[in-house]
């Protein structure tokens, strides 16, 4: 959010930026929590929108059998683990092939007994209300789809006849990550020292940080004729002065006439 | 990168000899794998036989095994495939492979260092 400035005012107002702000030589580049001139105004809506796509990652270790065991194995710049990088990942590509969740694997470290392979499988889904269903649904369907594998491909007399054999009682998930996507969370966070006045409401399932300040919300604080201002002790309303009215009360509801104050009388609405 | 170039193809009689070579280089080990590998017209590219350069371990398809022996040259870096009593059916394009891992599979797949092949013809 920028405000710009011309005039002989401008280098005044650079010494000024609050909250964060700084200058860029015509105006105040205000930090994501505020706006205005100075930056002196804290914004009333904050983009929590939820994140394209969620992802979740498998910790698995796998028992690869058709390969000796060498120390250069445990170098991940070698030639060695390259080239076994290159196969598994070709390997794991076909056995997760129908997952349309799957995104790849990604090696963590190989250990001596045939070849113990740590890895990760990470999936990622497009965000919906549902993505924990949709990733649960993909983990259980990568546990059924590795376990099959690593049972029927297996060395037959010291020989393998596939791309990768396995040895079938090698194979165990460790640990299963998904991001959590937690908007009232994220609004808290984001919202920083203001973080207590500041919720979350739902429109057509897409959550909205917001504090009193926005309108249109059922928290939304009505000023009628004033301005909602939000401060470290929370939303304010400032009230305006008209040309015959003064206004005041903490929703600027209470209105006094000018006319009538002057003749030393006082009249509310 | 790993570059193998096969040399020794050619026509034989049914009972003749030939030896194929395959030169290797680009390896940063002198610990690696090594094979063998045939295709007929039609048919799938299947393994003759496969040797580990550390002398660890040989392995001969069935088909093969007595007429022809693998071996490698390390100060060389060389692969050779001596083939004795050959037959009819030993006619086809050999394939030199190579992978930089100690590997037991025969399937192709597995490993992805070629050469661009050798026809060796038996008839007579």
């Known amino acids: 959010r920028t405000t710009t400035c011309f005039g002989d005012g401008c280098q005044n107002t650079a010494s000024r930026c609050k909250n964060g702000g700084t200058w860029d030589g015509l105006k105040c580049q205000c930090p994501n929590l505020y706006y205005g001139e100075l930056c002196e105004e804290v914004v009333s809506s904050i983009d929590i929108g939820p994140p394209e796509t969620i992802s979740a990652q498998m910790e698995l270790t796998v028992t690869v059998t058709s390969v000796k065991f060498t120390e250069e194995l445990k170098n991940h710049s070698s030639q060695e683990f390259q080239e076994f990088k290159q196969t598994f990942t070709e390997q794991m590509n076909i056995v997760y092939s129908g997952i349309p969740e799957y995104v790849g694997v990604n090696i963590t470290k190989l250990r001596l007994g045939s070849v113990v392979v740590e890895h990760d499988v990470l999936l990622r889904t497009k965000y919906t209300p549902e993505y924990k269903t949709v990733l649960d649904n993909a983990t259980e369907v990568v546990k059924e789809k590795i376990t099959k594998v690593t049972t029927q491909q297996i060395m037959i007399n010291d020989i393998c006849s596939d791309m990768m054999c396995f040895n079938t009682t090698g194979t165990q998930v460790q640990n299963i990550t998904v991001t959590q996507y937690d908007p009232e969370e994220d609004c808290r966070k984001m919202a920083k020292e203001y973080g207590d006045y500041f919720v979350v409401e739902y429109r057509d399932q897409k959550p909205y940080c917001i504090s009193p300040c926005e309108p249109g919300f059922s928290v939304s604080k009505n000023c009628n004729l004033g301005k909602c201002q939000m401060s470290l002790s929370g939303p304010q309303c400032l009230c305006v002065t008209t040309e015959t009215h003064w206004y005041s009360g903490e929703t600027c509801n209470q209105g006094t006439q000018k006319s009538l104050v002057y003749g030393h009388h006082h009249h509310h609405h | 990168d790993v570059q193998l170039v096969e040399s020794g193809g050619g026509v034989v009689q049914p009972g003749g000899s030939l030896r194929l070579s395959c030169a290797a280089s680009?390896?940063?080990?002198?610990?690696?794998?090594m094979a063998w590998f045939r295709q007929a017209p039609g048919k799938e590219r299947e393994v003759v036989a496969f040797?580990?350069?550390?002398?660890?371990?040989?392995y001969y398809a069935d088909s093969v095994k007595g007429r022809l022996t693998i071996s490698h040259d390390n100060a060389k870096n060389t692969l050779y495939l001596q083939m004795n009593s050959l037959r009819a059916e030993d006619t086809a394009v050999y394939y030199c492979a190579a992978s930089s891992l100690l590997l037991q599979t025969i399937n192709p797949r597995a490993w992805p260092y070629w050469g661009q092949g050798t026809m060796v013809t038996v008839s007579s």
């Open positions: 680009g390896y940063t080990s002198n610990r690696y794998s």
């Open positions: 040797i580990w350069t550390d002398g660890g371990r040989t």
